[in-house]
């Protein structure tokens, strides 16, 4: 706004910054065990994986950046059960990966299937 | 681990994933007003900026990825006071940018100067 008062280049820089902060899928580090709700005697190596999760800003304070579509990606991890009775097993672990995001009210009344962060 | 039992390529992929999840400065979207602790009648356009903040996993569950060094970067933003008595002003806003991170205990008893996230 108020474009007439300001240098076009400055406004362009500000606008680019704003675009980059918008609600979108962003690469995030998640802890596998807490993600899967595993008991403390099951753990993974590595304990964390990189996936995309919705994050960023919305135009209104009353809105929250939430996922509207999700895919599940498979990560090869060592699953270790304690007490250790066998060699740690290499297992494919499916982790939610957000593919679409939208700024939504905190208690959405529309039929999106949301997995909250 | 257990390198002898598994295909080297698979282990390499797992190790690379682990390296990418490690505690390090990551580009993050922060809300300027809450970052600066501004009153509700002052807001910024855009409301969010991109800076680097410490994030990721540590080798121990009891450690937290925290910043050990910080720079302050200046972002050009419109500062708007409500009720609007004048034209929105273009101001330089200094925001903390984490430049170094370390996995640290939550209540460090050693003399690190930590700015908690």
């Amino acid at each position: 706004f108020a474009a007439t008062f300001y240098d076009i280049e400055t406004l362009k820089v500000i606008d680019e910054e704003w675009q980059r902060t918008q609600c979108s899928p962003r690469e995030t580090c998640v802890e596998v065990a807490s993600e899967l709700g595993k008991s403390t005697n099951t753990f993974f190596k590595p304990p964390c994986v990189n996936v995309f999760r919705c994050g960023g800003c919305c135009n209104e304070e009353s809105l929250i950046c939430m996922n509207t579509s999700t895919s599940y990606i498979s990560k090869q991890l060592f699953e270790i059960s304690v007490p250790l009775t066998s060699v740690p097993e290499l297992v494919p672990v499916k982790v939610a990966n957000h593919t679409g995001c939208k700024c939504l009210p905190t208690a959405p009344r529309h039929p999106y299937s949301i997995i909250r962060r | 681990f257990a390198a002898t039992f598994y295909d080297i390529e698979t282990l390499k992929v797992i190790d690379e994933e682990w390296q990418r999840t490690q505690c390090s400065p990551r580009e993050t979207c922060v809300e300027v007003a809450s970052e600066l602790g501004k009153s509700t009648n002052t807001f910024f356009k855009p409301p969010c900026v991109n800076v680097f903040r410490c994030g990721g996993c540590c080798n121990e569950e009891s450690l937290i990825c925290m910043n050990t060094s910080t720079s302050y970067i200046s972002k050009q933003l419109f500062e708007i006071s409500v009720p609007l008595t004048s034209v929105p002003e273009l101001v330089p806003v200094k925001v903390a940018n984490h430049t170094g991170c370390k996995c640290l205990p939550t209540a460090p008893r050693h003399p690190y100067s930590i700015i908690r996230r």
Partner: antibody, heavy 118, light 112 residues
Framework: QVQLVQSGAEVKQPGASVKVSCKAS????????MYWVRQAPGQGLGWMGY????????TYNQKFKGRVTMTTDTSTSTAYMELRSLRSDDTAVYYC???????????WGRGTLVTVAS | DIVMTQTPLSSPVTLGQPASISCRSS???????????LHWLQQRPGQPPRLLIY???NRFSGVPDRFSGSGAGTDFTLKISRVEAEDMGVYYC?????????FGQGTKLEIK
């Protein structure tokens, strides 16, 4: 299987330095913190500090601050602990111990006896 | 530093009978993430310590089920349901919630 092989016993004079090595095998070296613990003859266990082999970050017990340095060589999966300005009360068995993600020291080296005597 | 106090310091036991070791910390060992990082180690004569129990009650790999851990906050217990000859040695509690990591002074388990 996980193994931590430590260097041999050392006899040092007061004021000297000692560097103990701990070669790890059977796991991804950079994925676990390495702790160093010492035990004086007939005494209990004392924690010296740890190193994160991924990036070389260290956290030391204040008791040893300025006298201890922990390092790693990721190419050989070896951790090192150097203790300087040795005194007679530094005579102890020095252990390296791998720490699991959940905080327990799950695998230990067999220990290196360091004797400080003039 | 967190002080870990073990009782008793020496415990003469009869083979086949139960044994119990107590460990009390000078501050709560509950981490800000809700977990409690209290562990138990066993050290047999001439051997390095060996992890028995991690995070209060989780038995480590290869540890017999006669060993169990319990407790919360500042008070913790290691129990051996039926003591065997191979259980003789010194038992240590340790905490990794706070820095510096600290150990109890040890409890010597010996045959009566």
């Amino acid at each position: 299987q996980v193994q931590l092989v430590q260097s041999g016993a050392e006899v040092k004079q007061p004021g000297a330095s000692v560097k103990v090595s701990c070669k790890a095998s059977g796991y991804t070296f950079t994925g676990y913190n390495m702790y160093w613990v010492r035990q004086a003859p007939g005494q209990g266990l004392g924690w010296m500090g740890y190193i994160d082999p991924y990036n070389g970050d260290t956290t030391y017990n204040q008791k040893f601050k300025g006298r201890v340095t922990m390092t790693t060589d990721t190419s050989t999966s070896t951790a090192y602990m150097e203790l300087r300005s040795l005194r007679s009360d530094d005579t102890a068995v020095y252990y390296c111990a791998r720490t699991s993600y959940y905080g327990g020291m799950d695998y230990w080296g067999r220990g290196t006896l360091v004797t400080v005597a003039s | 530093d967190i002080v870990m106090t073990q009782t008793p310091l020496s415990s003469p036991v009869t083979l086949g009978q139960p044994a119990s070791i107590s460990c009390r910390s000078s501050q709560s060992l509950v981490h800000s993430n809700g977990n409690t990082y209290l562990h138990w180690l066993q050290q047999r004569p001439g051997q390095p310590p060996r992890l028995l129990i991690y995070k209060v009650s989780n038995r480590f790999s290869g540890v017999p089920d006669r060993f169990s851990g319990s407790g919360a906050g500042t008070d913790f217990t290691l129990k051996i349901s039926r003591v065997e000859a191979e259980d003789m040695g010194v038992y240590y509690c340790s905490q990794s919630t706070h820095v510096p990591r600290t150990f109890g002074q040890g409890t010597k388990l010996e045959i009566k």
